[in-house]
């Protein structure tokens, strides 16, 4: 595993194939779970920040941004979105988490939450996925949509299996993050697959 | 096999420094964080800092932040830990531990390295 | 930083008995706690982690469960190789810290 701080993957450009594998050995459905990463794009349109697909299912868990100042996170197919006023192009800090007891979801942009929304109650997120950042993926690791893939800059790329309480998603986005257990910046284990470059991160 | 080798035992001088080795082999030592931990005779594991040995990356227990130093050498694959201003109460058997694949638990342990402080 | 309590800070037991060690959180550590094994001039050796999860090559007699600030280390027949000092640790936060042991003695 490599660790990342200080550094960002950048998809330089719209494309069908670029993208970057995450490995995570998760064994257990989630309950539970924190996603935080920054990500700097100039992209008006629709894309995919961060797919997470299981065997046979599409969307399991899913990170979009339907158009600027609108989150979408799906969690079993299913959707909910929120919004923010927010600057266009500009460096973002994006955090969201979810409860499976309360079906509650949550985002944080750049420290600030946004409305409480809930989907999936008592659902629990399947274990084995398979993680991709700069596509979306519409089965298990592939059948990618070039108009909904990412042109950016993604970094300080951080999952745990737990809900983080307010302060530690501050100090995630002031740059001192948990030890994260299920996908860690820090200790990041990963394949670039096409034309992604491993960069400095400049913009924070 | 996966080891790690640490250097002999010291005795040293209160006030003065003294510099840990820990030898790796049997994986790539630059893809896993380094830690340090340490055990006063007797008592329990306390832990110092960690050191990623490809981008040097460290983090620190506040405790030891002023007088700990994390290094590696890629070369030799070789992790060391500097502890400086040494007191009686830093008496203690100092290991390096690997960081496990995917989790922040320590699943490779050095032998051990025995520091005697004492005038 | 999280304090890491263990009970009872040591025990006497028989070999084939069935051991519980507590390691209480001062604050919620989620599941991110590992157990360690340490034998006198040892060093430790990885048990469990992720509270739960037995390490590749120990003994399925050795089981460890809980989240949040309570988890248990449980050995379920005692072999006379078991007789040592065990250490949880968290590493949901840092500093990582670790309980004080429970030095496990033949009875």
């Known amino acids: 595993h490599t660790d990342l701080s200080g550094k960002v993957f950048v998809f330089p450009r719209e494309s069908v194939t670029d993208h970057v594998n995450l490995i995570t050995p998760l064994e257990k459905p989630l309950q539970n779970f924190t996603l935080c990463f920054r990500a700097y794009s100039d992209l008006s349109r629709a894309y995919s920040l961060f797919s997470y697909n299981t065997q046979g299912r599409d969307n399991e868990l899913l990170v979009y941004k339907e158009r600027v100042g609108e989150y979408s996170l799906y969690i079993g197919r299913h959707k909910v979105t929120s919004k923010v006023i927010e600057k266009f192009p500009a460096p973002v800090h994006i955090c969201v988490s979810w409860e499976s007891s309360s079906g509650i979801a949550e985002f944080w942009i750049n420290g600030t939450p946004l409305v409480k929304k809930g989907l999936r109650q008592g659902y629990f997120v399947e274990a084995q996925p398979k993680i991709v950042l700069g596509q979306e993926q519409d089965s298990y690791g592939g059948k990618f949509d070039r108009s909904q893939s990412f042109v950016g800059e993604i970094g300080d790329l951080y999952m745990w299996d737990s809900v983080l309480p307010p302060e530690n998603i501050l100090s995630a986005y002031q740059g001192t993050p948990l030890p994260a257990n299920i996908l860690d910046w820090q200790a990041l284990n990963y394949e670039i697959r096409g034309y992604v470059i491993i960069k400095p991160l400049v913009w924070v | 096999q996966v080891q790690l080798v640490q250097s002999g035992a010291e005795v040293k001088k209160p006030g003065s420094s003294v510099k840990v080795s820990c030898k790796a082999s049997?994986?790539?030592?630059?893809?896993?964080?380094m830690h340090w931990v340490r055990q006063a005779p007797g008592q329990g594991l306390e832990w110092i800092g960690m050191i990623h040995p490809n981008s040097v990356n460290t983090n620190y227990n506040e405790k030891f932040k002023s007088r700990a130093t994390l290094t590696v050498d890629k070369s030799t694959s070789t992790a060391y830990m500097e502890l400086s201003s040494l007191r009686s109460e830093d008496t203690a058997v100092y290991y390096c531990?690997?960081?496990?694949?995917?989790?922040?638990?320590?699943?490779?342990w050095g032998q051990g390295t025995l520091v005697t402080v004492s005038s | 930083d999280i304090q890491m309590t263990q009970s009872p800070s040591s025990l006497s037991a028989s070999v084939g008995d069935r051991v519980t060690i507590t390691c209480k959180a001062s604050?919620?550590?989620?599941?991110?706690v590992a157990w360690y094994q340490q034998k006198p001039g040892k060093a430790p050796k990885l048990l469990i982690y992720?509270?739960?999860y037995r390490y590749s090559g120990v003994p399925s007699r050795f089981s460890g469960s809980g989240s949040g600030t309570d988890f248990t280390l449980t050995i379920s027949s005692l072999q006379p190789e078991d007789f040592a000092t065990y250490y949880c640790?968290?590493?949901?936060?840092?500093?990582?810290?670790f309980g004080q042991g429970t030095k496990l003695e033949i009875k």
């Open positions: 531990a690997r960081r496990n694949d995917y989790y922040w638990y320590f699943d490779v």
């Open positions: 049997g994986y790539t030592f630059t893809s896993y964080w």
């Open positions: 604050q919620n550590v989620n599941s991110n």
């Open positions: 640790q968290q590493c949901n936060n840092y500093p990582f810290t």
């Open positions: 992720s509270a739960s």
